[in-house]
């Protein structure tokens, strides 16, 4: 058993890109308070297992009124520590959520209004009994500076608060094989209460006679390394000969979770997923009501007027979980169309579009030819997010702005001579051929392959290609 302690040093504007507005005004004075939520382990916080290690609420800070025109300073803080008692072993690794709340003290109907100012979260390793650890976390334009530590409650000592200490029986020294209890030098480490022979390196216990194994070890005394080779059974304790797991009691056997909680195994122990209204390592803590403010991030608490009725948190957009403790990854909803890149700016989303697409959500398939004129009579052809001009004869280049030699491709057939013309090319056909490109032979009897020659043109005259 022990206590996690959190000391808030300052809450104010951070060095980031935007200066936050002061949360209070002359019209609406307010005061701050803080909430901390702790969970064991470094894993991603499960939405349905809030604050399994415990939670705490600070006192209200001094009333603050904004000075008109002044940037938001560091805001006045509540006195004292936030303390989260833990009943069992300190897990060594933990996740935290610290929220800064504003209580508005204007003339609200129905009492003061609460709103969330900032939320920070992190995962840390921490040994119980160690010094204060300092931290700085940023939430948007706000910065929170704080320190934390975990300390054991007597008679527990050690980095996990699992060793017990007792007052010395003799004034000068401890009994055989027992060390003084640092930092309580006037006490001695109690005799080991774990199962006899339990490995001191790979096993631990929380109750007398227990021997629980750390990850990677198994066996009744946690002396057998877990083999990574294929084994038939999913869990231990292991067979001493093979190192493979054989059927045996698991940490969830008998369901240690109270009040209808469901148990899931973790590498070191187990974790309880608690129903609404209950929390704690084994769902043993009950009596949470809406008055306790269990809904994070501005969630609206409904029901739960008394400890026997469950509350429900209605979460604001962007948050989910039974206590609205999980931020929705808005980009995971893939709001940007057509393969656009999604950026969550906090106050909004930003879509960066792939070539050929545009719009706030990349929803517009660009008409590649829209607003792009091909010069000199060229026509625009769309394709792949870029436009291409099909140029009229005599012109070339991306936009048909470059003059081209229309005769370069030798367009006149059957030995016809090509002449460049202001609107294209002209073919002067060799005797016996006619047509715009001299492609039609003139038949010996004087009839051509064409239905009729245009008026005023004789076979053999130059034909202008229009």
């Amino acid at each position: 058993a022990g206590v996690f302690e959190l000391q808030i040093h300052s809450f104010g504007p951070g060095p980031g890109p935007g200066a936050p507005r002061s949360p209070c005004s002359a019209r609406l004075p307010c005061r701050l308070f803080f909430r901390v939520c702790l969970k064991p382990g470094l894993s991603e916080e499960a939405a349905e297992s809030p604050c399994a290690l415990g939670a705490a609420l600070s006192a209200r800070g001094p009333v603050y009124t904004e000075q008109p025109g002044a940037p938001a300073p560091d805001l006045p803080l509540p006195d004292g520590l936030l303390q989260v008692p833990f009943r069992d072993a300190w897990p060594g690794t933990f996740s935290f959520i610290i929220e800064t709340w504003r209580e508005e003290l204007g003339d609200q109907i129905g009492g003061p209004a609460w709103s969330l100012l900032a939320r920070v979260a992190g995962r840390r390793r921490l040994a119980a009994g160690g010094p204060w650890a300092r931290d700085i976390q940023r939430a948007g334009a706000w910065e929170l500076r704080f320190s934390y530590r975990a300390r054991c409650e007597p008679p527990a000592v050690g980095t996990a608060c699992t060793r017990l200490c007792r007052p010395r029986s003799a004034p000068s020294r401890c009994g055989p094989g027992l060390r003084p209890c640092a930092p309580l030098e006037d006490e001695c480490e109690a005799p080991l209460v774990c199962r006899a022979g339990c490995s001191p390196e790979h096993g631990f216990c929380e109750q007398p006679g227990e021997c629980r194994c750390l990850e990677g070890w198994t066996g009744p005394l946690c002396t057998v390394p877990v083999s990574t080779s294929s084994c038939l059974s999913p869990r231990g304790p292991s067979s001493a000969t093979t190192g493979c797991l054989v059927p045996g009691p698991g940490p969830c056997d008998g369901n240690p979770c109270a009040n209808g909680g469901s148990c899931s195994e973790t590498p070191r122990s187990f974790e309880c997923t608690c129903p609404r209204g209950f929390y704690g390592l084994r769902c043993e803590v009950s009596g949470v009501t809406c008055a306790d403010g269990p809904c994070f991030n501005g969630g609206l608490c409904v029901g739960g007027a008394d400890p026997d009725s469950a509350y429900i948190c209605h979460c604001p957009p962007g948050f989910q979980g039974s206590n609205c403790e999980k931020r929705v990854d808005r980009c995971s909803l893939q709001p940007c169309r057509n393969g656009g890149l999604c950026l969550d700016l906090g106050h909004a989303l930003r879509c960066r579009c792939r070539a050929g697409f545009a719009g706030p959500r990349c929803e517009h398939d660009l008409d590649d030819c829209a607003g792009r004129a091909c010069a000199n009579g060229g026509t625009c052809v769309e394709g792949g997010g870029a436009h291409r001009c099909s140029c009229a004869l005599g012109f070339g280049g991306r936009d048909c702005r470059e003059r081209a030699d229309p005769c370069a491709a030798r367009p006149c057939a059957h030995g016809g001579r090509c002449y460049a013309h202001f609107s294209g090319l002209v073919c002067a056909c060799a005797p016996g051929y006619m047509g715009a490109r001299c492609e039609f032979p003139v038949h010996p009897d004087g009839a051509s392959a064409l239905p009729a020659a245009p008026p005023g043109l004789r076979p053999g005259d130059p034909q202008r290609y229009l």
Partner: antibody, heavy 128, light 112 residues
Framework: QEQLVESGGGLVQPGASLTLTCKAS????????MCWVRQAPGKGPEWIAC???????AYSASWAKGRFTVSKTSSTAVTLQVTGLTAADTATYFC??????????????????????WGPGTLVTVSS | DIVMTQTPASVEAAVGGTVTIKCQAS??????LAWYQQKPGQPPKLLMH???VLTSGVPSRFSGSGYGTEFTLTISDLECADAATYYC??????????????FGGGTEVVVK
């Protein structure tokens, strides 16, 4: 007609403070960010800060942090407060609108990333 | 923060000619590029956004292209009214969580 008009510029002493105001008319102030951009004589535009009108979120250039504060003062006006003015702050200060777009059922508004309406600017000269 | 580099700093062309202005971003900005025209004593005017989408009322003589880090503004059939300074601009979002805007240094277009 959509319009932005800046005011509050003029000749100020080094070290002084100044508040510039931008008044909007002809369009709905919401679903837009109102921004400040300055331009020193003969130089290119330099973005200072924006405030997103829907929730009051402010964001600013890293170099502007601390001395420049953008605020929304009414449903049609924003201000830029500048402290500790130096000669390097001499510039025309423009108010500009950066549109945001909302869609029914979408999780958020969407930033456009550009400025589609500008005020004529107000000249700030810092000199002793 | 992102850096936008414009070239050339100045360009001269005759009426009816074509001018090409380049803008390079220091990182991939996809199509997040806008172009502005500014005349002396006036604020910048948005010509184009999303690299190639013309703003309403801007003549089709103005065209934009590019993607990623390299972008181009082309003005064809130059008119005297096109004499101005042109700026490219993008927005950025850094891993530290800061969002903002950056402009290029500008290109002065002189029409003969």
């Amino acid at each position: 007609q959509e319009q932005l008009v800046e005011s509050g510029g003029g000749l100020v002493q080094p070290g002084a403070s100044l508040t510039l105001t931008c008044k909007a008319s002809g369009f709905d102030f919401t679903s837009n960010a109102m921004c400040w951009v300055r331009q020193a004589p003969g130089k290119g535009p330099e973005w200072i800060a924006c405030i997103y009108n829907d929730d009051g979120s402010a964001y600013s250039a890293s170099w502007a942090k601390g001395r420049f504060t953008v605020s929304k003062t009414s449903s049609t006006a924003v201000t830029l407060q500048v402290t500790g003015l130096t000669a390097a702050d001499t510039a025309t200060y423009f108010c500009a609108r950066s549109p945001y777009y909302t869609y029914g059922g979408a999780p958020s508004a969407y930033a456009s990333g550009y400025f589609n309406l500008w005020g004529p600017g107000t000249l700030v000269t810092v000199s002793s | 923060d992102i850096v936008m580099t414009q070239t050339p700093a100045s360009v001269e062309a005759a009426v009816g000619g074509t001018v090409t202005i380049k803008c390079q971003a220091s990182e991939n900005i996809y199509n997040s590029l806008a172009w502005y025209q500014q005349k002396p004593g006036q604020p910048p005017k948005l010509l184009m956004h999303d690299a190639s989408v013309l703003t309403s009322g801007v003549p089709s003589r103005f065209s934009g292209s590019g993607y990623g880090t390299e972008f181009t503004l082309t003005i064809s059939d130059l008119e005297c009214a096109d004499a101005a300074t042109y700026y490219c601009q993008s927005d950025y979002y850094s891993t530290g969580g800061s969002y903002g805007f950056a402009f290029g240094g500008g290109t002065e277009v002189v029409v003969k």
